[in-house]
Interface confidence: medium
């Protein structure tokens, strides 16, 4: 058993048929010694008396808010949550496996630049009685600070018969060094509580590996005289690290016909303009990637040819 | 060319070669197997390779103030990785494919280090630990890890030279 926060405790249970469970001793936080009784949740049934209560925690029915009273007055509470372990593996019932980039990916994170700011998100089908708490650090043996905000519900989607909820959190490294080569990864730890079930999820990454620039901005076409060619120009996204002479991007320019089956013409360039042939009913799209490290491409920015 | 006295390197040549190094480091990576480092449980054990750290003056302001600190750090790293790529980790069995970019990568590391420090000039080089003989069973994993960290190292070096070429060239 360990303390998650004040008056909230997590009991770690091996979860298998007829498991013996865990013996837990609760102590009433009071100077009183006599006339103390204990109850669980909203029940008025007295579970025991005395300053301590010993319980055998085996299942969710044994978890909940234990309260000690004296003469009708509440003295203190202890909320017990369960953390299940099956075959030596902690349960992952609360969050959905996003399966990208590999199986057992519950947390996904992205950064728009090298400032040390990043966003993580996760999915669940649970809509109520759900709380999240997020902590992060750079490295784990001698951790350096990363500050995370509160996790918020950022999207709702319908997937078949189910509703899916996306939660996200923003974090910022306290003393970020954008130009340095990272040697210790960022660690992100999410505590999830659904009713009386506790689970924790972790992710470890370098900022450089989760970089995904915003799409290029101000995408414009300029027809070239007496030609089917156009000059496409764009700018670095506002959110990208500066100076751009140091934090450089490379770009992919694509001409795509109306039909998905039509051949795509692609040009790669380090410049912020390119000359392409604009076909009727086609669109021109541009995306960006770090020039020197192959992290994710941005989403496409697009304009129609006409 | 960078000399110990502090004159400028050939920024544009260094930029071109460092960008080539980035391309080669990424093209070499698939040849050592698609493993996920994070599954190895040793994310914090990359202390066998040099890193360009916050105090090394490789940020835009540090380069403007005095690029020599950063260039020396990059030079040390290039020599270190050049030694690693020339060691039995890469030359021993299981043999690399004949057309592996690792040979080109090795030559380019040497080329860039020489651009930074031509013959006859000597920076203090970081003491390179004697490389323990690797065993075949370790090599695939070591190649992967070395190339992963090399990708990160050359990305920073390429940024330095791109910025230098754009803002510090005479």
């Amino acid at each position: 058993i360990w303390e998650l926060k004040k008056d909230v405790y997590v009991v770690e249970l091996d979860w298998y048929p007829d498991a013996p469970g865990e013996m837990v001793v609760l102590t009433c936080d009071t100077p009183e010694e006599d006339g103390i009784t204990w109850t669980l949740d909203q029940s008025s049934e007295v579970l025991g008396s005395g300053k301590t209560l010993t319980i055998q925690v085996k299942e969710f029915g044994d978890a909940g808010q234990y309260t000690c009273h004296k003469g009708g007055e509440v003295l203190s509470h202890s909320l017990l949550l369960l953390h299940k372990k099956e075959d030596g593996i902690w349960s992952t019932d609360i969050l959905k496996d996003q399966k990208e980039p590999k199986n057992k990916t519950f947390l996904r994170c992205e950064a728009k630049n090298y400032s040390g700011r990043f966003t993580c998100w996760w999915l669940t089908t649970i809509s109520t009685d759900l709380t999240f708490s997020v902590k992060s650090s750079r490295g784990s043996s001698d951790p350096q600070g990363v500050t995370c905000g509160a996790a918020t519900l950022s999207a709702e989607r319908v997937r078949g018969d189910n509703k899916e909820y996306e939660y996200s959190v923003e974090c910022q490294e306290d003393s970020a060094c954008p130009a340095a080569e990272e040697s210790l990864p960022i660690e992100v730890m999410v505590d999830a509580v659904h009713k009386l079930k506790y689970e924790n999820y972790t992710s470890s990454f370098f900022i450089r590996d989760i970089i995904k620039p915003d799409p290029p901005k101000n995408l414009q076409l300029k027809p070239l005289k007496n030609s089917r060619q156009v000059e496409v120009s764009w700018e670095y996204p506002d959110t990208w690290s500066t100076p751009h002479s140091y934090f450089s991007l490379t770009f992919c320019v694509q001409v795509q016909g109306k039909s998905k089956r039509e051949k795509k013409d692609r040009v790669f360039t380090d410049k912020t303009s390119a000359t392409v042939i604009c076909r009727k009913n086609a669109s021109i799209s541009v995306r960006a990637q770090d020039r020197y490290y192959s992290s994710s491409w941005s989403e496409w920015a697009s304009v129609p040819c006409s | 060319r960078a000399v110990p006295g502090g004159s400028s390197p050939a920024w544009t040549q260094c930029q071109q070669l460092s960008q080539k190094l980035c391309t080669l480091a990424w093209s070499a990576h698939p040849l050592v197997g698609h493993m996920d480092l994070r599954e190895e449980g040793d994310e914090e054990t990359t202390n066998d390779v040099p890193h360009i750290q916050c105090g090394d003056g490789c940020d835009p302001q540090g380069l403007r103030d005095n690029s020599q600190f950063c260039l020396q750090r990059i030079h040390q790293g290039l020599i270190f990785y050049e030694k690693l790529l020339g060691s039995d980790i890469f030359t021993g069995e299981p043999s690399l494919l004949p057309d592996s970019p690792v040979g080109q990568l090795h030559a380019s590391l040497l080329g860039l280090s020489q651009l930074l420090q031509p013959e006859g000039h000597h920076w203090e080089t970081q003491q390179i630990p004697s490389l323990s003989p690797s065993q075949p069973w370790q090599r695939l994993l070591l190649r992967f890890k070395i190339l992963r960290s090399l990708q990160a190292f050359v990305a920073v070096a390429a940024r330095v030279f791109a910025h230098g070429a754009a803002t510090l060239s005479p």
Epitope: - | Q135, P136, Q138
Partner: antibody
Framework: EVQLLESGGGLVQPGGSLRLSCAAS????????MGWVRQAPGKGLEWVSG????????FYADSVKGRFTISRDNSKNTLYLQMNSLRAEDMAVYYC???????????WGQGTLVTVSS | DIQMTQSPGTLSVSPGERATLSCRAS??????LAWYQQRPGQAPRLLIY???TRATGIPARFSGSGSGTEFTLTISSLQSEDFAIYYC????????FGPGTKVDIK
Amino acid sequence: EVQLLESGGGLVQPGGSLRLSCAASGFTFSKYNMGWVRQAPGKGLEWVSGIWPSGGWTFYADSVKGRFTISRDNSKNTLYLQMNSLRAEDMAVYYCARVSEYGSFDYWGQGTLVTVSS
Amino acid sequence: DIQMTQSPGTLSVSPGERATLSCRASQSVSNNLAWYQQRPGQAPRLLIYSASTRATGIPARFSGSGSGTEFTLTISSLQSEDFAIYYCQQSYSTLTFGPGTKVDIK
């Protein structure tokens, strides 16, 4: 004389943790790859984990990846194996061994028994 | 991973006789092969490395041969202390041991 002495074994419940130590003497510890090999009761030998001389690179058998962590303290001439989320199939005698430059284990400790049972 | 197989599972030999133990790898391991002896209640002891090189202090009656996928450990004249289990191990890919051959007294 090369000596390797393991300690830290014992009885642990499934899902529990143990940390094994191996004190080395009689050779320059910081120059050698080191490893752990285990042997389940009445069974053969199974390589578990290995570590590079400086500790900078580590290697694991698939059966323990993500649960076990090998480390070393060259100043103390000591090798460690942190074992988490232990399972019944991890029950074995764990040997600490020095790895020769040929990939063979040229010196072995006497072993420490790890029992995983509820 | 490379699989190692050993034959026979048990070999019954009289003292003074010759014993020949086989080890086969599921793919070529070049000469990256070692042999170990393990007596009851003891830790394994390295006998042969690099397929044919005797380890320090190992008597000349032990010899190893082979390359690629087929390897042999020969004990030219068995002594009483040689009755034990013998394991082969490859170090070409992720380290794996053979299941062992038990040499007992006929």
